[in-house]
Interface confidence: low
C-alpha cells in the first residue's frame, strides 16, 4: 500500500484565556505541547479507516484535533459530527504538509462524541475517527498518602490510591515551626515516592492530582525536644497503617532508644532503627514504630525510652469512623462598627477536614491551624461588618458539622419610608432595635413637635435568614392628618434617624432625611 | 430520653389563624433545629419551615410564605407554629420534627406526636 | 424545588421477601437523602439518613444506598412489623419529600 499517505493524528491541549474564548480563529490560545494521539489504520474496515486514540477532555477546556497529511498535491476535507457536516479548510505548513485542525472551545456534553474528518488527496481517499469523551471526573478520588516500608531498605515509600495517578513528592524541613510553612526557603520537595534521609526534623509526604492535593505528616515524638503541654494524639482508622517516628541526639553514640505500648515492648517486625552522625558530629538516632494495618487493640499510650533522654508518650487512638468534635451550639455577638472582630471554631477532627465560611450564601476560603492541645482552629475576620447569620461548616470522609454565629453591629438607625393610599410605613436597620416616634408637622406645629400616638402600628423585629435585624412601624391614616407632612423617627442608643413623609396621594413621597445624633 | 409533645387537636374556621406548640425535652434545646412538616388526610409528608431555635432565625417553604410564621421560647423549650388565613385544604397532621445532626442537612430523628387542625366552616 | 420521585408507589410483598423501593431526584443531591417509615396515625420514624447510615436503633435488615441523583431502601427480610408507608426526603436544599411507598400484605 505504497500509495498511502503518512498520517499524523495530535491533540493541543489550550490554556483558556478569556479574552480569546468564544472566538472562532483556528488558535485562539495559550497551547501546550500537541499530544500524538497515534492513528492506526483500522483493520477490516470498507475503504481506508484511520482511528486515532480516545481523546478524554476535561469540560470547559479548549482543545484542537488535528490532522498533519503527508501526502503529495492538494486535499480538500470534511467534517461530520453527529450527522452534521462541518466547515473544512485545510493549509499547509512549513513543511508542505497538509494541516487540518478542528477546534472545541470549552468543551460541554454536546460536544462529545465521534468527529470523522474525510480527505480527499489526488492519490485517495481516506477517513480518520476520533472519539471525544468529557472526563468522568465522578470516577476521580484523591486519597491521603500513607506510608510503607521499604522491602530490605531503610527507606519509606509513600503511597496514595488515587484516580488519576498522582504525582507524589517528600516535603521535607529541618526548622522549627513557623519556618516550616510550605513555601519557606527551609522546605526542600522532592518529587519522589521512596525516602532515604529519614533525620529531619519535619516529613510530609504530599499527592496530587485534578482534584488537588493531600498531605500526611510523619508523626514524630522529639526527645530533645520539651514535650507539648498536652500529650500528642494521633487517631487513626481501622485498617489504616502507623507511624510513629521517635528521634533523639546525643553527644556520643552510647545511647539506645526503644518503644513501649502500655508498657509492653513492641514486638520485633513492629520497630526499625536508623542512625547517623550529624555535621557537628553528634549521634541522631531514629526508631520506627509501625503497625501496617491497625486494629482496635493497637489503641494505647506509645512511649519512646531513652538511656540518654527523659522518655515520652503520645497516645494512638483507633476508631471505626472519622470524626469532628466542636462544639455546634449557635454563638450571638455584638460589635461596634469599626470593632475589630473574628469568628472562630475550635474543633478536633480526624481526617482533617475540608471547610467554609458562608454568609449570605457565599462561600469564602477556610484556613485551619494546628493548636499545640491536638486541636485545630479556624478564623473568619473577614464579614466586612455585614450583620446577618455566618455558618461554618466542615467535613471529612466520615463526619459534617455545621456551626451558627450571628453578628449584630452596634449602630445609628438608618430610616426609609412608603406611602399608600390607606398608611405610611417607615423602616429601620439599626441595632439595637430602634423605638419609634411619629410626629404632625402644621402651622401649629412647624417643627414637627405635635406627636401622633393612635394609629401607629410597631412591628416586631423581622430577622431575615441571611440579613439584619428590621424593625418598621406603619401609621394608619385618618382625616386628621390626611395633606400633612407626617415624620417617623426610629432611636436606639445610638442615634436617632428621622424620615418626612406627604400623606396626600398614593405613592411615595419621602423627601427630607434628618440625622438628628 | 429527647421529646416532642404537642399541643391537642383545633377546629378553626376558613380565615381563622391557628397556633401549635411543640415542648422539646431531653437534650439541650437551642443546639437542633426544628422543622415543621404538614400531612394532609391520607396524603403525603409536606416541609413547611425550619426554626433556629438559638437565633430564632426561621425559612419558610415558598409556599408558606406570608401566611406561617415560626417562633420560640427558650425559656420553656417550645417552638410554635402559627398559620393565618386558614383554608380548608389546611385540615391535616402538624409535625414538629428535630433536625437529626443540629444543621439543616440530615434527616428529622425525632418527631412530635402531631396535632389535628381541622379547618371547617 | 427538587422533585423527589419514589417507585413503586405500592408494592404487596410477604414476610420474608426483601424489598426494594427506590427514589430519583429531579437534580443531583450528592448524599442528602434520609428515609422515613410511617404507620398509620403515627408519626414518621427516621430509618436511614445521609442515604447510607442507619439511624440508631433501627434493625440492620434496612439499608440505603445511592448518591447524587439515583437512591435505594433495601429491606432484606420483610418482618410484620415493616407494612407501612415509606418516605425519602432531600434536604440538600428546601427539604421535599417523595410521595410515599406503600408495602402492603400480599
Known amino acids: 500500500n505504497q500509495d498511502l499517505p503518512v498520517i499524523k493524528c495530535v491533540l493541543i491541549n489550550h490554556k483558556n484565556n478569556d479574552s480569546s474564548v468564544g472566538k472562532s480563529s483556528s488558535y485562539p490560545m495559550v497551547s501546550e505541547s500537541p499530544e500524538d494521539l497515534g492513528c492506526a489504520l483500522r483493520p477490516q474496515s470498507s475503504g481506508t479507516v484511520y482511528e486515532a486514540a480516545a481523546v478524554e477532555v476535561d469540560v470547559s477546556a479548549s482543545i484542537t484535533l488535528q490532522v498533519l497529511v503527508d501526502a503529495p498535491g492538494n486535499i480538500s476535507c470534511l467534517w461530520v459530527f453527529k450527522h452534521s457536516s462541518l466547515n473544512c479548510q485545510p493549509h499547509f505548513d512549513l513543511q508542505n504538509r497538509g494541516v487540518v485542525s478542528m477546534v472545541i472551545l470549552k468543551m460541554t456534553e454536546t460536544q462529545a462524541g465521534e468527529y470523522l474528518l474525510f480527505i480527499q488527496s489526488e492519490a485517495t481517499n481516506y477517513t480518520i475517527l476520533f472519539t471525544v469523551s468529557i472526563r468522568n471526573t465522578l470516577l476521580y478520588t484523591l486519597r491521603r498518602p500513607y506510608f510503607r516500608k521499604m522491602e530490605n531498605q531503610d527507606a519509606l515509600v509513600c503511597i496514595s490510591e488515587s484516580v488519576p495517578e498522582p504525582i507524589v513528592e517528600w516535603v521535607l524541613c529541618d526548622s522549627q515551626g513557623e519556618s516550616c510553612k510550605e513555601e519557606s526557603p527551609a522546605v526542600v520537595k522532592k518529587e519522589e515516592k521512596v525516602l532515604h534521609e529519614l533525620f529531619g526534623t519535619d516529613i510530609r509526604c504530599c499527592a496530587r492530582n485534578e482534584l488537588g492535593r493531600e498531605c500526611t505528616r510523619l508523626f514524630t515524638i522529639d526527645l530533645n525536644q520539651t514535650p507539648q503541654t498536652t500529650l500528642p494524639q494521633l487517631f487513626l482508622k481501622v485498617g489504616e497503617p502507623l507511624w510513629i517516628r521517635c528521634k533523639a541526639v546525643h553527644v556520643n553514640h552510647g545511647f539506645g532508644l526503644t518503644w513501649e505500648l502500655e508498657n509492653k515492648a513492641l514486638e520485633e517486625g513492629n520497630y526499625f532503627e536508623m542512625s547517623t552522625y550529624s555535621t557537628n558530629r553528634t549521634m541522631i538516632r531514629i526508631l520506627f514504630a509501625f503497625v501496617s494495618s491497625v486494629a482496635r487493640n493497637d489503641t494505647g499510650y506509645y512511649t519512646c525510652s531513652s538511656s540518654k533522654h527523659p522518655s515520652q508518650s503520645a497516645l494512638v487512638t483507633i476508631v471505626e469512623k472519622g470524626f469532628i468534635n466542636a462544639t455546634n451550639s449557635s454563638e450571638d455577638y455584638e460589635i461596634d462598627q469599626y470593632e475589630e472582630f473574628c469568628f472562630s471554631v475550635r474543633f478536633k477532627a480526624y481526617p482533617q477536614i475540608r471547610c467554609t465560611w458562608t454568609f449570605s450564601r457565599k462561600s469564602f476560603p477556610c484556613e485551619q491551624k494546628g493548636l499545640d492541645n491536638g486541636y485545630s482552629i479556624s478564623k473568619f475576620c473577614n464579614h466586612k461588618h455585614q450583620p446577618g447569620e455566618y455558618i461554618f461548616h466542615a467535613e471529612n470522609d466520615d463526619a459534617q458539622f455545621t456551626k451558627m454565629f450571628t453578628l449584630n453591629i452596634r449602630r445609628k438607625p438608618q430610616v426609609l419610608a412608603e406611602a399608600s393610599a390607606s398608611q405610611a410605613s417607615c423602616f429601620s436597620d439599626g441595632y439595637p432595635l430602634p423605638s419609634w416616634t411619629w410626629k404632625k408637622c402644621s402651622d401649629k406645629s412647624p417643627n414637627c413637635t405635635e406627636e401622633i400616638t393612635e394609629g401607629v402600628w410597631n412591628r416586631k423585629a423581622n430577622r431575615k435568614v441571611f440579613g439584619q435585624w428590621v424593625s418598621s412601624s406603619t401609621l394608619n391614616m385618618s382625616e386628621a392628618i390626611k395633606g400633612f407632612l407626617v415624620k417617623c423617627c426610629a432611636y436606639n442608643s445610638l442615634g436617632t434617624s428621622c424620615e418626612t413623609i406627604l400623606l396626600n396621594s398614593p405613592g411615595p413621597f419621602p423627601f427630607i432625611q434628618d440625622n438628628i445624633s | 430520653q429527647v421529646q416532642l409533645v404537642q399541643s391537642g387537636a383545633e377546629v378553626k374556621k376558613p380565615g381563622a389563624s391557628v397556633k401549635v406548640s411543640c415542648k422539646a425535652s431531653?437534650?439541650?434545646?437551642?443546639?437542633?433545629?426544628m422543622h415543621w412538616v404538614r400531612q394532609a388526610p391520607g396524603q403525603g409528608l409536606e416541609w413547611m419551615g425550619i426554626?433556629?431555635?438559638?437565633?430564632?432565625?426561621?425559612s419558610y417553604a415558598q409556599k408558606f410564605q406570608g401566611r406561617v410564621t415560626m417562633t420560640r421560647d427558650t425559656s420553656t423549650s417550645t417552638v410554635y407554629m402559627e398559620l393565618s388565613s386558614l383554608r380548608s385544604e389546611d385540615t391535616a397532621v402538624y409535625y414538629c420534627?428535630?433536625?437529626?445532626?443540629?444543621?439543616?442537612?440530615?434527616?428529622?430523628?425525632?418527631w412530635g406526636q402531631g396535632t389535628l387542625v381541622t379547618v371547617s366552616s | 424545588d427538587i422533585q423527589m420521585t419514589q417507585s413503586p408507589s405500592s408494592l404487596s410483598a410477604s414476610v420474608g421477601d426483601r424489598v426494594t423501593i427506590t427514589c430519583r431526584a429531579s437534580?443531583?443531591?450528592?448524599?442528602?437523602l434520609a428515609w422515613y417509615q410511617q404507620k398509620p396515625g403515627k408519626a414518621p420514624k427516621l430509618l436511614i439518613y445521609?442515604?447510607?447510615s442507619l439511624q440508631s436503633g433501627v434493625p440492620s435488615r434496612f439499608s440505603g444506598s445511592g448518591s447524587g441523583t439515583d437512591f435505594t431502601l433495601t429491606i432484606s427480610s420483610l418482618q410484620p412489623e415493616d407494612f407501612a408507608t415509606y418516605y425519602c426526603?432531600?434536604?440538600?436544599?428546601?427539604?421535599?419529600f417523595g410521595q410515599g411507598t406503600k408495602v402492603e400484605i400480599k
Open positions: 420534627a428535630r433536625d437529626r445532626a443540629a444543621r439543616p442537612r440530615g434527616g428529622f430523628d425525632y
Open positions: 431531653g437534650y439541650t434545646f437551642t443546639t437542633y433545629y
Open positions: 426554626i433556629n431555635p438559638s437565633g430564632g432565625s426561621t
Open positions: 437534580q443531583g443531591i450528592r448524599n442528602h
Open positions: 445521609a442515604a447510607s
Open positions: 426526603q432531600q434536604s440538600y436544599s428546601t427539604p421535599t
